[in-house]
């Protein structure tokens, strides 16, 4: 190995200067006594190398690149060798930015998977390998005093979410949670969340059903629909409020919202709809009056309202 490059820093802020030195050992006797060291960044020759012979007989060339505007490039030092360029050594240079503060950190408790799932926005591209770690601790109070640390949660590459499993959670107790971003240029931390996992619980939605007509019950009036729902059993003991949305299947009508409905209603007569019209309906619920997240909308139920009553009965609807 005849040559060796050393750099002021292999990773710098994008646009910052970088200084490199290439030293050629004296015992490389096959070289010219006064070889001219050339510099190349990627495929481009770089002027401005200052060359000198050191007291021990080695040759040194120093170059300063005033602005490294490539996020990744190879810097090499070389000699002319016959008609070709002989590479003596090369180093990889990286340029980018320190991580921005991760923002919009939010979490939800999934009672089915028994895990607290947190997600965040990582901020602008750093152009450098950047690791994110979800850090947390248990706290008896409002997270001012730190209790036991919880094992760091490291997302899979490229993901901006992480799941803390049940064994690391304490329900009905606060946890301090934040995201730490780290790369070669620095470290940043998101603002800390302080939350009780149960206060960010996201329930599964109920299943909508048509109400089985019973012999003694009156059939629905024109423009009305009778429906019922089967609550998600594991969430049954959590007080909730629910809301329905509906729209005609045909046409461009937007969803109309009906609510709040208590989960316990379990059945509902929806009126004021167009007669003889097919409707799509969905329901969702949220823990209430305690804090929580809305469930997803349930799978759709499709129902048709009955025909309008004959004209000679029309006056009954006004009483």
């Amino acid at each position: 190995e005849c040559g060796h490059i050393s750099v002021s820093a292999p990773i710098v802020h994008l646009g910052d200067p970088i200084t490199a030195s290439c030293i050629i050992k004296q015992n490389c006797s096959h070289l010219d006594p006064e070889p001219q060291i050339l510099w190349r960044l990627g495929a481009e020759l770089q002027p401005g190398g200052r060359q000198q012979r050191l007291s021990d007989g080695t040759q040194e060339s120093i170059i300063t690149l005033p602005h490294l505007n490539h996020t990744q490039a190879f810097l090499s030092c070389a000699l002319n060798w016959g008609n070709s360029l002989q590479i003596l050594d090369q180093v990889e240079l990286r340029a980018g930015y320190p991580p921005a503060i991760p923002h919009n950190l939010s979490c939800l408790m999934n009672l089915t998977t028994s895990s607290l799932i947190c997600q965040w926005e990582p901020g602008p591209e750093t152009h450098l390998p950047t690791s994110f770690t979800l850090k947390s601790f248990k706290s008896r109070g409002n997270c001012q005093t730190q209790g036991d640390s919880i094992l760091d949660c490291v997302p899979k590459d490229g993901q901006s979410h992480c799941s803390i499993p049940r064994k690391h959670l304490l329900l009905y107790q606060n946890m301090g949670i934040w995201v730490q971003a780290e790369n070669a240029l620095g470290t940043s931390m998101s603002p800390q969340l302080c939350l009780d996992p149960m206060d960010v619980v996201k329930l599964e939605p109920p299943m909508l059903r048509t109400m089985d007509p019973s012999p003694e019950a009156a059939p629905p009036q024109a423009g009305c629909l009778q429906l019922s729902w089967e609550p998600w059993q594991p969430g049954l003991h959590i007080n909730q409020k629910c809301e329905l949305r509906h729209k005609p299947q045909r046409g461009e009508a937007s969803w109309a919202l009906v609510g709040p409905l208590p989960l316990e209603a379990l059945q509902y007569e929806l009126c004021g709809l167009l007669p003889a019209t097919a409707y799509t309906l969905q329901i969702r619920c949220i823990r209430w009056p305690l804090p929580g997240h809305w469930s997803d909308w349930s799978p759709s139920l499709e129902l048709r309202t009955t025909e309008r009553a004959p004209t000679h009965h029309h006056h009954h609807h006004h009483h």
Epitope: L111, T112, T113, S114, R166, K167, L171, M198, P231, Q233, P234, L236, H237, I238, N239, P262, E264, A265, L266
Partner: antibody, heavy 118, light 107 residues
């Protein structure tokens, strides 16, 4: 401090009726599911029935369905179990319990003994 | 209905022993598994809920683990006051069901 106090147990003949009460204090009764669990002498625990916070949902064990009725009066902070057509196998200590959001029975009363015998 | 099978039905142990009780559900119940302690003539007392959460006031020598169908209650160092009967209960869906109980006796 949460307290649950059952009453209404006693000796009753087969086919007879009994109404158990559970007076609750120390928490906002109207916000919680409540339930009844029984334990026959020398046996394990058996869930009997539960009731939602406003009384709209009332699941029952198959063994008591159609014979027992659970109810609550939120204005009186009281849970009830009306037991009709009683059988010898209904003999047990009956406990009332306050349920948590995950179905756990967080607090229990001291129990009241129901004996069905001729 | 979901059947809950507890084992062993009884065990003898000494003060200071590590004791493990298992509970198996006949179908998956996620983490909806609760553990209770009952002493003779007394009402049951909640120890662990949602498989691994220690109820307030319960000593930290009690711990719970497992999910799906297989669950464990562990007493890390048995104390004189821990001799009792222990029950598991699933609250995943109705009807709620209890295990048959495990009686922990003094060796």
């Amino acid at each position: 401090e949460v307290q649950l106090l059952e009453s209404g147990g006693g000796l009753v003949q087969p086919g007879g009726s009994l109404r158990l009460s559970c007076a609750a204090s120390g928490f906002t009764f109207s916000l919680y599911w409540m339930g009844w669990v029984r334990q026959a002498p020398g046996k394990g625990l058996e869930w009997v029935s539960s009731i939602s916070s406003s009384g709209g949902v009332t699941p029952y064990a198959d063994s008591v369905k159609g014979r027992f009725t659970i109810s609550r009066d939120n204005s009186k902070n009281t849970l009830y179990l009306q037991m009709n057509s009683l059988r010898a196998e209904d003999t047990a200590v009956y406990y009332c319990a306050k349920l948590g959001e995950l179905g756990q029975m967080v607090y229990w009363g001291q129990g009241t003994l129901v004996t069905v015998s001729s | 209905d979901i059947q809950m099978t507890q084992s062993p039905s009884s065990l003898s142990a000494s003060v200071g022993d590590r004791v493990t009780i298992t509970c198996r559900a006949s179908q998956g119940i996620s983490s909806y598994l609760n553990w209770y302690q009952q002493k003779p003539g007394k009402a049951p007392k909640l120890l662990i809920y949602y498989a691994s959460n220690l109820q307030n006031g319960v000593p930290s020598r009690f711990s719970g683990s497992g999910s799906g169908t297989d669950f464990t209650l562990t007493i890390s160092s048995l104390q004189p006051e821990d001799f009792a009967t222990y029950y598991c209960q699933q609250s995943f869906k109705y009807p709620m069901t209890f295990g048959g109980g495990t009686k922990v006796e003094i060796k």
